[in-house]
């Protein structure tokens, strides 16, 4: 079940997604897509970052936060009813089957007849509760010297998104975090 976020027609919608780089500048490629996260990559890609910059985007879709600090939350400008649906935020950690993928549901409501005086966004789901887990390392000893330094040990995300962290084996070593919300 996806996390649900709401916005009104004509407003900007905000879909939160964050990760904490293991070290300053250790950015991870991220993609946003319309539709549930597939096995790999993002379908109907809206925006993509690499290790340095936003290298693909489409109109109305922006990262307004500081993505260099891991804030890859998506802002959709001037939403319409057609923007309703499932969105995928994918943290593309290098390696086989390492990606963290999060499905977020956006519900667009018709604009209120009487405008709200100050509120610009309506998040009924707002920021969901967090579940923090700590990985337990593999039974075998592996040669860590050959492994990259993006390893993640702590994944913070929603209970219903946790299931299996997919950070196989030794990707649990560095103190970085991933979360949505």
């Amino acid at each position: 079940s996806e996390v649900e976020y709401r916005a009104e027609v004509g407003q900007n919608a905000y879909l939160p997604c964050f990760y904490t780089p293991a070290a300053p500048g250790n950015l991870v490629p991220v993609c946003w897509g319309k539709g549930a996260c597939p096995v790999f990559q993002c379908t109907n890609e809206l925006l993509r970052t690499d290790e340095r910059d936003v290298n693909y985007w489409t109109s109305r879709y922006w990262l307004n936060g500081d993505f260099r600090k891991g804030d890859v939350s998506l802002t959709i400008e001037n939403v319409t009813l057609a923007d309703s649906g499932i969105y995928c935020c994918r943290i593309q950690i290098p390696g086989i089957m390492n990606d963290e993928k999060f499905n977020l549901k956006l519900v667009i409501k018709p604009a209120k007849v009487t405008p709200a005086p100050t509120r610009q966004r309506d998040f009924t789901a707002a920021f969901p509760r967090m579940l923090t887990t700590r990985g337990h390392g593999p039974a075998e000893t592996q040669t860590l010297g050959s492994l990259p330094d993006i390893n993640l040990t702590q994944i913070s995300t929603l209970a219903n998104e946790l299931r299996d962290s997919r950070l196989a084996n030794d990707l649990r070593d560095s103190g970085a975090t991933i979360r949505i919300g």
Partner: antibody, heavy 118, light 113 residues
Framework: QVQLQQSGGGLVQPGGSLRLSCAAS????????MSWVRQAPGKGLEWVSG????????YNADSVKGRFTISRDNSKNTLFLQMNSLRAEDTAVYYC???????????WGQGTLVTVSS | EIVMTQSPDSLAVSLGERATINCKSS????????????LAWYQQKPGQPPKLLIY???TRESGVPNRFSGSGSGTDFTLTISSLQAEDVAVYYC?????????FGQGTKVEIK
């Protein structure tokens, strides 16, 4: 030492099913992601399917999506590939492979031949 | 997905001579944050499963003779056999494990001239 012993291959008609097994020894299966890689006769290597250490997440190549299911029984230290709706183009030697830390395939099974033919 | 292309498809080298195999990826497999190239090389002899030779572009797997070496970065990689031995006759594959499904080159067959 690490060993991956495969079984379950054979001749099957198009549309049929087969289940491949890969019995692991020398390491704890639940600590490692695993994959199946196939090789059509006289051709190169093609990744088919993968599964996380706990078995909670599975991944399939587009060519087998909806037809093949990878699973594991960690209590028996065994990896499986259930192959349904088999096609002639699925004819290949299938290898199970251990993934070292989500990066590369450090140990391979001996391979088992799957032939799909009428 | 990342496409891996090897050259040449086959290679005949005299015993004791150098053999060089090239591998090119359709996009970079270098992760700049750790300066590692997510590329491995495998050797497959007839009737046998592939065997890991080299990972992280240039790190030899335990037990692999030091006549095998790997180099390159980004999208262009090379496997070199410095002095070909009879037991090196095989097909060699490169593989990326940077993103998406792991993908292999089409293979290079090394024979003795």
């Amino acid at each position: 030492q690490v060993q991956l012993q495969q079984s379950g291959g054979g001749l099957v008609q198009p549309g049929g099913s087969l289940r491949l097994s890969c019995a692991a020894s020398g390491f704890t299966l639940s600590s490692y992601a695993m994959s199946w890689v196939r090789q059509a006769p006289g051709k190169g290597l093609e990744w088919v399917s993968g599964i996380s250490g706990s078995g909670g997440s599975t991944y399939n190549a587009d060519s087998v999506k909806g037809r093949f299911t990878i699973s594991r029984d960690n209590s028996k230290n065994t990896l499986f590939l259930q192959m349904n709706s088999l096609r002639a183009e699925d004819t290949a030697v299938y290898y199970c492979a251990k993934i070292f830390g989500s990066y590369y395939f450090d140990y391979w099974g001996q391979g088992t031949l799957v032939t799909v033919s009428s | 997905e990342i496409v891996m292309t090897q050259s040449p498809d086959s290679l005949a080298v005299s015993l004791g001579e150098r053999a060089t195999i090239n591998c090119k990826s359709s996009q970079s497999v270098l992760y700049s944050s750790n300066n590692k190239n997510y590329l491995a090389w495998y050797q497959q002899k007839p009737g046998q499963p592939p065997k890991l030779l080299i990972y992280w572009t240039s790190t030899r797997e335990s037990g692999v003779p030091n006549r095998f070496s790997g180099s390159g970065s980004g999208t262009d990689f090379t496997l070199t056999i410095s002095s070909l031995q009879a037991e090196d006759v095989a097909v060699y594959y490169c593989q990326q494990y940077y993103s998406g499904p792991p993908t292999f080159g089409q293979g290079t067959k090394v024979e003795i001239k």
